[in-house]
Amino acid sequence: APEVSEEPRCPRAACQAKRGDQRCDRECNSPGCGWDGGDCSLSVGDPWRQCEALQCWRLFNNSRCDPACSSPACLYDNFDCHAGGRERTCNPVYEKYCADHFADGRCDQGCNTEECGWDGLDCASEVPALLARGVLVLTVLLPPEELLRSSADFLQRLSAILRTSLRFRLDAHGQAMVFPYHRPSPGSEPRARRELAPEVIGSVVMLEIDNRLCLQSPENDHCFPDAQSAADYLGALSAVERLDFPYPLRDVRGEPLEPPEPSVPGGGSGGGLNDIFEAQKIEWHEGGPPHHHHHH
């Protein structure tokens, strides 16, 4: 079992100055140094903050089952205790096919496994949705049109990593909630400089997690109960340099939302942020969208 000993304070004075500077500095990539102030963990402060066994971060990447670390709070020990040694990744022979046929409305049983992303729920139309709490917000360093061109591949790969089903959150008009992300000119810059057309450097993507098949599977103890725990897991993979996802992520987080209204098209959309997005026709800037906290 992992030792429950206090993590050392950040041993390097230089790390204080490097926190949050958009560079993952290897020597500062540790819990004591806050994963370089989030620079190495996709801006997740501490992916293991809920985990009481303090050494689980060390064991996360060891491909061995460490039972004391297999809880949701400890990020399921990177699924090392799951599937009894079964293949952890989608069979490479199927992977391209599964990405091309993800959520295309036709059930492909070869793709209907957690490691292949559950075929985008094409085989689960009769099963009611079971949405995790909140919405997973990713900032991806690809412009929206490029990201949407490869949306099936994007969702299939992310679903496979998280071992559950991901889909774009839809707005009140049934449109995927994928927004341009650009860096603003700092307020201190001269007015003329600030009026340069802001450069679109990525997309802010809002995703829902549908656990209907994850919770139905024989070992259903590894599903992410909320969007923040999924964000923590992605941050953890990034911190240990094991995030095999071909879309460059700037940051990830979970946003709490009020429960979806079933009358809105898309089933999982409506309420909460939608009206605000509609009113603002929002294009998010550095730091992302406003945080709206709702009590459940």
């Epitope: 100055a17 560079r23 290897r26 360093l141």
Partner: antibody, heavy 119, light 107 residues
């Protein structure tokens, strides 16, 4: 559009120093790190180091610590690199580039500054 | 420090042929690789970032692939204007090392 304009070629004597500039335009200068890259004649590219115009923080290739000094002038959106104690090994083209956030790929490059060290 | 090793050092290819060049990292770097093209007398140009993403304006005959330690840049139909040096670069953690380059010539 994004542009990086570098200062002109320099012919310098061994043991002397040289300071070159890289003027950025078309984007918010303080939002992106500026990186410097060396290319000796007929050779590959070598990453020298980078500076954050926002904080002044720097990261260096160990090989260039003590050789290169990186500074910025935010008021003119200009980055500078000074090379000291020059030898013939320092004769090369030096490029400035803009490092993209978090990952540091280089989509924008200056035209290069040729430094020739000769007595 | 992670070393990036490119192979082959040079290749001579006919117009219309498919070309694949390699970049090997001495340790796992995930997807953190970029590819650049450099022609004589010019600054390098970004082709591929984060292993497989084509940069804006890059022709779709250029494809990047790989993960971990082994990466490839493929040109699926060589054009005369593709004759150049090609460099891979490690991203995300400093030092942001470049490979030694592959020289691609027209046969």
């Amino acid at each position: 559009q994004v542009k990086l304009l570098q200062s002109g070629a320099a012919l310098v004597k061994p043991g002397a120093s040289v300071k070159m500039s890289c003027k950025a335009s078309g984007y918010a200068f303080t939002d992106y790190w500026v990186t410097w890259v060396k290319q000796s004649h007929g050779k590959s590219l070598e990453w020298i180091g980078e500076i954050s115009p926002n904080s002044g923080g720097t990261n260096f290739n160990e090989k260039f610590k003590g050789k290169a000094t990186l500074t910025v002038d935010k008021s003119t959106s200009t980055a500078y690199m000074e090379l000291s104690r020059l030898t013939s090994e320092d004769s090369a083209i030096y490029y400035c580039t803009r490092g993209e956030i978090r990952y540091n790929w280089f989509a924008y490059w200056g035209q290069g500054t040729l430094v020739t060290v000769s007595s | 420090n992670i070393v990036m090793t490119q192979s082959p050092k040079s290749m001579s290819i006919s117009v219309g042929d498919r070309v694949t060049m390699n970049c090997k990292a001495s340790q796992n770097v995930g997807n953190n690789i970029a590819w650049y093209q450099q022609k004589p007398g010019q600054s390098p140009k970004l082709l591929i970032y984060y292993a497989s993403n084509r940069y804006t304006g890059v022709p779709d005959r250029f494809t990047g692939g790989g993960y971990g330690t082994d990466f490839t840049l493929t040109i699926n139909s060589m054009q005369a204007e593709d004759a150049a040096f090609y460099y891979c670069q490690r991203l995300y953690n400093s030092p942001f090392t470049f490979g030694s380059g592959t020289k691609l010539e027209i046969k």
